[in-house]
Structure formats: C-alpha cells, structure tokens
C-alpha cells in the first residue's frame, strides 16, 4: 500500500477521504487508526456505526469524526481543530470479524496557519497570486471534491 498525503492547517478542519470498492467491502464496518511506529500496531481512533446500514451517521471520538458512503465507496474522516500532534501516519480500514484490511495509508501533514503571526521569524504577506481566502481553503479530496474548493472550512 502506497501512501496518500493530506495537508491541513493548525486550528482548522482537515477532511480525509479514502475511496474503496463498494462491492468488495459490502456489509463491512470501517475504522480509522493511527500507526504507532513504522512496524508497530495501528491504534483505533474511531469506527463507523455498529449497524452497517447506519454507517452514514457521523460518529465522533474527541475531535475526530468518521462517516461512510457505502454506496459510493468513500470513507470520510474529519479531524477538527487540527494540532501539530495530529501529524503522522494513519490507516483507513475495512473490518471483518476480528480482522482489518487496509484500504489506504494516509500521512497527515500539519502546517502553520498563514494568518497566525505568532510564529517568530515568519513575516508573511500574501503574494501576488494568492489571497487570504486562498490560504484558508479546506484541504479535502474525494472523487468529487476537487471540482470546486471550499473557501472556508465549517466551524462545527
């Protein structure tokens, strides 16, 4: 499994999408786990609803939410109020019994907020081809999401 990089801004929301074959994984619950070291175990963060038919319902664990479009075959994880300690390697998983298949390895990169001027030695002014609005695009991707950018992430 190769890795997909998602980059987000500290203090904002990051949406991660893991596409999968909806037929192959029909009836299976999904999970989001954090990889502990390169060869260590993957520690469960959050999983979809216990009833597979209710997988579309968003489930939270702390600041992390999961929801599954079982027909479209897209697992979506939202990391709210992203912090530097959220950076690292994760997995989207498909569960069957006590086993878990890796759908996708995900590397979360956290970057400084361009509008937060508390970082010493980091003077910043918008360049000619970027605006403050551009700097606050929510970092998200899925089959359909890249058509139009979301100018401001939801604060929920």
């Amino acid at each position: 499994h190769n890795t997909t990089v998602f980059q987000g801004v500290a203090g904002q929301s990051l949406q991660v999408s893991c596409p999968y074959d909806s037929m192959k994984h029909w009836g299976r619950r999904k999970a989001w786990c954090r990889q502990l070291g390169e060869k260590g175990p993957c520690q469960r963060v959050v999983s979809t609803h216990n009833l597979w038919l209710l997988s579309f319902l968003r489930r939270w664990n702390g600041s992390t939410a999961i929801t599954d479009d079982t027909l479209g075959g897209t697992l979506t994880i939202t990391l709210r109020n992203l912090q530097p300690h959220d950076a690292g390697l994760y997995q989207c998983q498909s569960l069957h019994g006590s086993e878990a298949d890796t759908l996708r390895k995900v590397l979360v990169e956290v970057l400084a907020d361009p509008l937060d001027h508390r970082d010493a030695g980091d003077l910043w002014f918008p360049g000619e081809s970027e605006s403050f609005e551009d700097a606050h695009v929510e970092h998200s991707i899925s089959r359909s999401l890249l058509e139009g950018e979301i100018p401001f992430p939801p604060t929920s």
């Epitope: 190769n2 997909t4 990089v5 990169e109 970057l111 400084a112 970082d119 003077l123 360049g127 890249l146």
Partner: antibody, heavy 118, light 107 residues
Framework: GVQLQQSGPELVKPGASVKMSCKAS????????IHWVNQKPGQGLEWIGY????????NYNEKFKGKATLTSDKSSSTAYMELSSLTSEDSAVYYC???????????WGQGTTLTVSS | DIQMTQSSSSFSVSLGDRVTITCKAS??????LAWYQQKPGNAPRLLIS???SLETGVPSRFNGSGSGKDYTLSITSLQTEDVATYYC?????????FGGGTKLEIK
C-alpha cells in the same frame, strides 16, 4: 511576491557530498511544504521528497533514501538538500518547489545545476 | 509506484490549432493530477491542479479534464508562447510521479 531562490551551480568530484539551499520569501515559510525535484539533461522530472518546515517532517521517494537528506531552518526561511556519495549519475538540475493547498507545485526555484566529474 | 504515461513524447502543431495532450495513470488517482509547462532552461510552471482547476494567471485557452486513470490537457488555440514541454504529475500516492513529457513543436 513569492520567491524561491536556489544556490548556485556546483561542480564536485565523485564520492563527495554537496548541500544546496532554497531560500523562501514573500510568504510564511512554515505554512507550505517544500519539495525537491530533479531533472537530468534532456530528461523528465523526478520527485525526490519533501520537508514540512513547520514540523520538520520529511517524506522521501524510496529511490533517494540514503542519497538525499532534507532539512530546513525556520529562522532564515531556508530549505536544504544534501546529496551524498555522488556519482556522475547524480548530475542534474535540482529544483525546490512549494506545494499549494491544492497540492500542485505552484512556485519553483530557478534550479541548481549539479555536475559530478573527476 | 504509480506510472504516468503521456502517449506522445512530441507533437508537430500549427499556430491556432487545438491541441490535446493525454496522460494515463496506472491506477485511479482520484483527480489528484497537476499539469506543468516547461520551456528550455526554465523551471516548470504549474498550469492546472486537481485535474481541472486553472491556476491564477494561466490563460483560459488551457483546460484540464478527466477522472479515474485518464486525464487530458487541452489548448484551444495554440499561441507561439505555448511551444514548450508539458508534464502531468500525480499526487495521490507517494512517491509522487511525473509523466515523461510531451514536447510541442511548430510544423
């Protein structure tokens, strides 16, 4: 405006190491990832890896692990790439580039030409 | 690694022509695709990211389309300044990979 200024051309002997720099200006250095890409004469582009200046996290193309080492210095808004155990195969133009929030590389340095020859 | 294949390494074109450059990924890259233009002696320039989003300052005659494994860069009416080499790049899966390039030459 945004600029990535790379260090000048390098002529080095086989077996030696070289460290090239990429100085960023016109934007907040810790808000964007810096990538390194090489291009051999008359050939295409190849991704070497990136550094996240905010976390100092790196991600390498497996092919360049052990060959390239990426670092950054927040105080001077500069990214560095060190290449070791150089051979003539490493002769190329090396670019640094910033990835935008849509992930494409929106600003590039002018390139550093590395020539490895005895 | 994901292979990016640009079917033509070079194209002979006339000014004013509509030009279509194709790029095929070895697996689905879910629209995580960028197009670059490079002129001799210069660094590449980002034209399109997210398969379809035109970068600021890029003329509207450039258009990106496609999904899944197959992507296209179109130039509606070729201008002199468009003569260059064009590269596609996927950033769905590490290592991020580029196509071999398509060089446009005037007939």
């Amino acid at each position: 405006g945004v600029q990535l200024q790379q260090s000048g051309p390098e002529l080095v002997k086989p077996g030696a190491s070289v460290k090239m720099s990429c100085k960023a200006s016109g934007y907040k250095f810790t808000s964007y990832i810096i990538h390194w890409v090489n291009q051999k004469p008359g050939q295409g582009l190849e991704w070497i890896g990136y550094i996240n200046p905010y976390s100092d996290g790196t991600n390498y193309n497996e092919k360049f692990k052990g060959k390239a080492t990426l670092t950054s210095d927040k105080s001077s808004s500069t990214a560095y790439m060190e290449l070791s155990s150089l051979t003539s195969e490493d002769s190329a133009v090396y670019y640094c580039a910033r990835s935008s929030y849509r992930y494409g590389f929106d600003y590039w340095g002018q390139g550093t030409t590395l020539t490895v020859s005895s | 690694d994901i292979q990016m294949t640009q079917s033509s390494s070079s194209f002979s074109v006339s000014l004013g022509d509509r030009v279509t450059i194709t790029c095929k990924a070895s697996e689905d890259i879910y629209n995580r695709l960028a197009w670059y233009q490079q002129k001799p002696g210069n660094a590449p320039r980002l034209l399109i990211s997210g398969a379809t989003s035109l970068e600021t300052g890029v003329p509207s005659r450039f258009n990106g389309s496609g999904s899944g494994k197959d992507y296209t860069l179109s130039i509606t009416s070729l201008q002199t300044e468009d003569v260059a080499t064009y590269y596609c790049q996927q950033y769905w899966s590490t290592p991020w990979t580029f196509g071999g390039g398509t060089k446009l030459e005037i007939k």
